[in-house]
Interface confidence: medium
Amino acid sequence: LKGQEFAPSHQQVYAPLRADGDKPRAHLTVVRQTPTQHFKNQFPALHWEHELGLAFTKNRMNYTNKFLLIPESGDYFIYSQVTFRGMTSECSEIRQAGRPNKPDSITVVITKVTDSYPEPTQLLMGTKSVCEVGSNWFQPIYLGAMFSLQEGDKLMVNVSDISLVDYTKEDKTFFGAFLL
Amino acid sequence: LKGQEFAPSHQQVYAPLRADGDKPRAHLTVVRQTPTQHFKNQFPALHWEHELGLAFTKNRMNYTNKFLLIPESGDYFIYSQVTFRGMTSECSEIRQAGRPNKPDSITVVITKVTDSYPEPTQLLMGTKSVCEVGSNWFQPIYLGAMFSLQEGDKLMVNVSDISLVDYTKEDKTFFGAFLL
Amino acid sequence: LKGQEFAPSHQQVYAPLRADGDKPRAHLTVVRQTPTQHFKNQFPALHWEHELGLAFTKNRMNYTNKFLLIPESGDYFIYSQVTFRGMTSECSEIRQAGRPNKPDSITVVITKVTDSYPEPTQLLMGTKSVCEVGSNWFQPIYLGAMFSLQEGDKLMVNVSDISLVDYTKEDKTFFGAFLL
């Protein structure tokens, strides 16, 4: 009997049916970041390319001022990758002296802002200690999951240090969301 | 009024509706790779299992000669994980002498080939420096994002060094795509 | 002729159409783990929050006793991130003596249990060597892919060492699945 409620379409189907092609969707790609003032203990937000190259927004999903604006309530899959790159972390010098220490780290957070809530909500976080010795380093952090969002919610990607973000290629650092 | 255009199905709905179960989909899993000649500065492509174990292709999504062939235009979610493994990187020997150096690295690229374009398009890249000291190492790189593809586009996964790919288990190294 | 079978909905459409909003979906978030007895050579399963905060289950997708229960056959996208954290791995001490060795490691496995099968099936594995020197460390492992599941299948997340899992924040360690 499973699936019986989804009868051939000449019959009544009460749940609203959707053409998949008209669902809100966006894939944003990295651009060179302008370091901006941000509050202490608050990670800066990345800004993004939304229409050139691989980037697009469609079906009322809009990008403005570092935010993806959710046009319709529903369950969304949200993802981002940020590639970081840096010189040898200071951690290594302390390490070589044989003392344990608080490691350097890189962090990505996908954050939801709801105007009616005073505080942003952290949806996803990827955080990694970086303790490299003797060479430059580079590595990605990838995140992705499904969340129930409301019309008007705004999504952004925050990072622990904007100066470590690899902005050189659109395939290395990106951010996207689509209604399921 | 949102969703009003998706009326009960005895009414006219102009957007083409789809049964989700007949959308093109594929999940490919790793097999032992045969190192092949490839052009200098061009990463070799992996080949894949497409029907045994967890692997499948369905609804006209076909796999042939290292490529997933896109049978229908639309927005696809594309993903891959490659697990790499290796012996101590040479980098470590240089490092121990206390000299910074260009690190060894591992890279995965998901590439789109369009016959009418002379150059492949890199959709996704995960790249990581590897500077390990004194032991074998292993680690995955995961990628996933949504892209607008055209009928006839071909997708492949390229890696920086095919000999470092862990081909031993289908759950460690894989590649997939599905129409949203 | 592509898509011709998906005619305006006053015509006959034989494939069962679905409202997207009523598909089985779940996003589970980390809770503090109670170390439990587990068989040697078998990784322990994590348990999860399923209704507080960002966590939810809907449309007959139920969570019980560490398992997500699949209520309907079909193709599902399944994902998880586990953030691990630990003290300096022992590996580093051995390394400093200049001897190559088997590295410490962290592993996440998404496992499918089918009652009619004697053995669980490993769907996804992320495994990483950890050889840190002189500091605490933390890092995520992310996994996600599409699988064909049957009604009654059960999904769980297993880890190599439950004591290393960062259970402090719902955005750091999570597990989800949704019917495509």
Partner: antibody, heavy 121, light 107 residues
Framework: QVQLVQSGAEVKKPGASVKVSCKAS????????MHWVRQAPGQRLEWMGW????????KYSQKFQGRVTITRDTSASTAYMELSSLRSEDTAVYYC??????????????WGQGTMVTVSS | AIQLTQSPSSLSASVGDRVTITCRAS??????LAWYQQKPGKAPKLLIY???SLESGVPSRFSGSGSGTDFTLTISSLQPEDFATYYC?????????FGGGTKVEIK
């Protein structure tokens, strides 16, 4: 077909050097590693070192460090192993063997026929 | 270096017998172990890689198992051409090392 053909038997005096060649055919030489393994009469196999035929990087067993040199000539699809300061205990059959992977060794899938090296005064 | 100890060092068996050879590593080597067959005057031949994967072209009567420190090579039904010496080899860390060998003789 895929094969490795080694040079012929050698007789050397103590203190001399020997250079054994290994010609590859039937596959892309530069896509694999080449290892050298020896076997003294009645003894177990002993790994000496390897070369990444693509980039020429080498790794040697500590036991032979300073005495062994592994090289390759990509134009001739040939690898070479030179062992210097020979002593009587170096009397053995020397094998080249293809490593499927140049990094994480999943064993040696193709072997040469072996070259007998005798060290005798 | 990682030591590999094979047992027995020799065994006598008849055609059709099930034969088991073990290899113990002095420290954990994950699944990084291979098995070879060597006949007198010939080069070794790869049978099993990654502890349990059968090399292409090798008869299915050969199988490998184990992980960590204890490994087994099994010949399910010994054939006349299987009388030879068998070696295990670890490729987990440098230097790569071999076991002492197990000679399988005709009873």
């Amino acid at each position: 077909q895929v094969q490795l053909v080694q040079s012929g038997a050698e007789v050397k005096k103590p203190g001399a050097s020997v250079k054994v060649s290994c010609k590859a055919s039937g596959y892309t030489f530069t896509s694999y590693a080449m290892h050298w393994v020896r076997q003294a009469p009645g003894q177990r196999l002993e790994w000496m070192g390897w070369i990444n035929a693509g980039n020429g990087n080498t790794k040697y067993s500590q036991k032979f460090q300073g005495r062994v040199t592994i090289t390759r000539d990509t134009s001739a699809s040939t690898a070479y192993m030179e062992l210097s300061s020979l002593r009587s205990e170096d009397t053995a059959v020397y094998y080249c063997a293809r490593g499927y992977s140049s990094a994480w060794f999943d064993a040696f899938d193709i072997w040469g026929q072996g070259t007998m090296v005798t060290v005798s005064s | 270096a990682i030591q590999l100890t094979q047992s027995p060092s020799s065994l006598s068996a008849s055609v059709g017998d099930r034969v088991t050879i073990t290899c113990r590593a002095s420290q954990g080597i994950s699944s990084a172990l291979a098995w070879y067959q060597q006949k007198p005057g010939k080069a070794p031949k790869l049978l099993i890689y990654d502890a349990s994967s059968l090399e292409s072209g090798v008869p299915s009567r050969f199988s490998g198992s184990g992980s960590g420190t204890d490994f087994t090579l099994t010949i399910s039904s010994l054939q006349p051409e299987d009388f030879a010496t068998y070696y295990c080899q670890q490729f987990n860390s440098y230097p790569l090392t071999f076991g002492g060998g197990t000679k399988v003789e005709i009873k």
